[in-house]
Interface confidence: low
């Protein structure tokens, strides 16, 4: 609520009133107030609010009180001249009380001409037959926003899911600048994207960096005078590479004798991204291996012919054991047994010569 100072009768000055050089102004104020019928002290329906002068544009201060027979502004303890007031008066139909409203215009020059430690201020004073009431003080300040940020965000390279802090201290200004953050020119809304948090001192926190947070971030300071952008900080969210699992061992690369087997892995689990580190260590492992050499089979020499049997044949044989086939070597080609007719020995009859009969080993 407002601080209302109540003064009864015509004692409308108080300790901070220095009086006014505008004597004719005070002559306008009534020396006494009618006491019949009794009416309450003025009550402010609208009090003047603090205002900011932007560039050279003057500001209007406004107040409204009821009941009020007179209403004036004073600024920095001095009465504002009557001719500088714009006053309007009407009767409130419900209460029958007089409602007065008043506005004044304050220029940049007036504010700049004030010397002293206190800011330029104005307040409204309203009179009724019961006395006076003062409104709160409304401060009038020259608005500005300096160009230089006190702290600007710096670019960062961060790993996936790492927390990121981007700092920003806006330029000095009146009124104090509001701060918002842009991600690639889009306003960050922490209510919508809960991975973002803006601290009370305007820093941006990315709680757990995602790949999609790789972007340009800009701190924006704004007040009623201007909007300023900080330098852009580029955040790169990188992913360090990780090895896949090893493949199975390959077969031995030598068909005969010493060789090697190998297995491989790739840096794809995940693959490095945005400058993340490549996997450390070997992508290929080898171990020695020996493959037994194949031995092709070879025949032994033929045996001697057997004696001529009762069937008038004799035979001879050989073996595939000189050497026998080994480790996938080739078998011997050709006959294991040979037989042919004969007429000697135990042969019971003479037979005409016939072709050899070949018996093949299985």
């Amino acid at each position: 609520g407002s601080h209302h100072h109540h003064h009864h009768g015509s004692d409308y000055k108080d300790d901070d009133d220095k009086g006014s050089q505008d004597d004719e102004f005070f002559h306008e104020l009534p020396e006494t107030f009618p006491s019949d019928p009794p009416e309450p002290l003025p009550h402010f329906l609208i009090e003047p609010e603090e205002a900011y002068i932007v560039k050279n544009k003057p500001v209007n201060l406004y107040c409204k009180a009821s009941p009020a027979t007179q209403i004036y502004f004073k600024c920095n303890s001095e009465w504002v001249h009557q001719k500088d007031h714009v006053v309007d008066e009407r009767v409130d139909e419900t209460s029958g009380l007089i409602v007065r409203e008043v506005s004044i215009e304050i220029s940049r020059q007036q504010v700049e001409e004030l010397f002293g430690p206190e800011d330029y201020w104005c307040q409204c004073v309203a009179w009724s037959s019961a006395g006076t009431t003062k409104s709160r003080k409304a401060y009038v300040r020259i608005a500005y926003l300096r160009k230089t940020f006190e702290q600007e965000p710096l670019g960062k390279e961060v790993s996936l899911e790492q927390e990121v802090l981007l700092q920003c201290r806006p330029p000095e200004g009146i009124p104090v600048a509001e701060v918002e953050w842009l991600k690639n020119e889009d306003i960050i809304d922490p209510a919508e994207d809960r991975n973002f948090y803006i601290t009370i001192d305007h820093n941006l926190i990315i709680k757990q960096a995602r790949l999609s947070d790789t972007a340009n971030y800009t701190c924006v300071a704004k007040n009623i005078v201007a909007k300023r952008k900080s330098t852009t900080a580029t955040v790169i969210v990188y992913v360090n590479g990780g090895w896949s699992t090893w493949t199975e061992w390959s077969v031995c690369n030598s068909r005969c004798g010493r060789g090697y087997q190998k297995r491989t892995r790739t840096c794809t689990n995940p693959a490095p991204l945005n400058g993340g580190a490549f996997c450390e260590g070997q992508s290929v492992q080898k171990i020695a291996c020996t493959t037994l050499c194949p031995v092709d089979g070879r025949w032994t020499s033929w045996s001697k012919w057997s004696t001529c049997g009762t069937e008038c044949t004799h035979w001879r044989r050989r073996e595939c054991t000189a050497p026998a086939p080994k480790n996938g070597g080739k078998d011997c080609d050709g006959l294991v047994l040979q037989s042919k007719n004969c007429t000697d020995g135990l042969c019971m009859q003479a037979a005409p010569d016939s072709d050899d009969v070949a018996l093949y080993g299985s």
Partner: antibody
Framework: QVQLQESGPGLVKPSETLSLTCTVS????????WSWIRQPPGKGLEWIGY???????NQNPSLKSRVTISVDTSKNQFSLKLSSVTAADTAVYYC?????????????WGQGTLVTVSS | DIQMTQSPSSLSASVGDRVTITCRAS??????LNWYQQKPGKAPKLLIY???SLQSGVPSRFSGSGSGTDFTLTISSLQPEDFATYYC?????????FGGGTKVEIK
């Protein structure tokens, strides 16, 4: 109140290029992600891709080689071209606005336009 | 791509019922989940964004919850105008993907 309106032919022949335009009214095309989404008859929703007024685009890899999305900020419009269409591309095509960042949600949609691919 | 699985695919309920629809992501998507309502012949309408934030103008009987991989849309007291198909959509990474939909029918 932001409104989106799709326009373009309702019938496209197989192997030809489907072309649609979305006109945005009641608001600026700046600083949002403008998406195309489709819905085959009786089926679910499939995101095709988006474009930002800066020209940044992102397409669904399943369609990427056939999709072109462009923006004309002066006309407050963005467009979709889908080449080499087949019957499988028959769908209601929606344009939608993705609010804020690419984290989207789609808060405004066009009413949709049915595109039939048939000879 | 992140797969979104909705269950049930359809359900029957009566006016006044409490209805729950679930959506599961194939990997963690934090809170990057949106819910939409679609009526026949109409465009989808945003109900809930960022898993639990109610879109402006949407009745408070709709609520969303969940984080990570499991999410829920709840209609506290089903109204006649709520009979529709509901879709979830992840916005954690592109390609943006939708669930298959849940059709809410009158019992």
């Amino acid at each position: 109140q932001v409104q989106l309106q799709e326009s373009g032919p309702g019938l496209v022949k197989p192997s030809e290029t489907l072309s649609l335009t979305c006109t945005v009214s009641g608001g600026s095309i700046s600083s949002y992600f403008w998406s195309w989404i489709r819905q085959p008859p009786g089926k679910g929703l499939e995101w095709i891709g988006y474009i930002h007024n800066s020209g940044t685009t992102n397409q669904n890899p399943s369609l990427k080689s056939r999709v072109t999305i462009s923006v004309d900020t002066s006309k407050n419009q963005f467009s979709l071209k889908l080449s080499s269409v087949t019957a499988a591309d028959t769908a209601v095509y929606y344009c939608a606005r993705g609010r804020g960042m690419a984290t989207l949600p789609f808060d405004y949609w066009g009413q949709g336009t049915l595109v039939t691919v048939s000879s | 791509d992140i797969q979104m699985t909705q269950s049930p695919s359809s359900l029957s309920a009566s006016v006044g019922d409490r209805v729950t629809i679930t959506c599961r992501a194939s990997q963690s998507i934090s809170s990057y989940l949106n819910w939409y309502q679609q009526k026949p012949g109409k465009a989808p309408k945003l109900l809930i964004y960022a898993a639990s934030s109610l879109q402006s103008g949407v009745p408070s009987r709709f609520s969303g919850s969940g984080s990570g991989t499991d999410f829920t849309l709840t209609i506290s007291s089903l109204q006649p105008e709520d009979f529709a198909t509901y879709y979830c959509q992840q916005s954690y990474s592109t390609p943006l993907t939708f669930g298959g939909g849940t059709k809410v029918e009158i019992k």
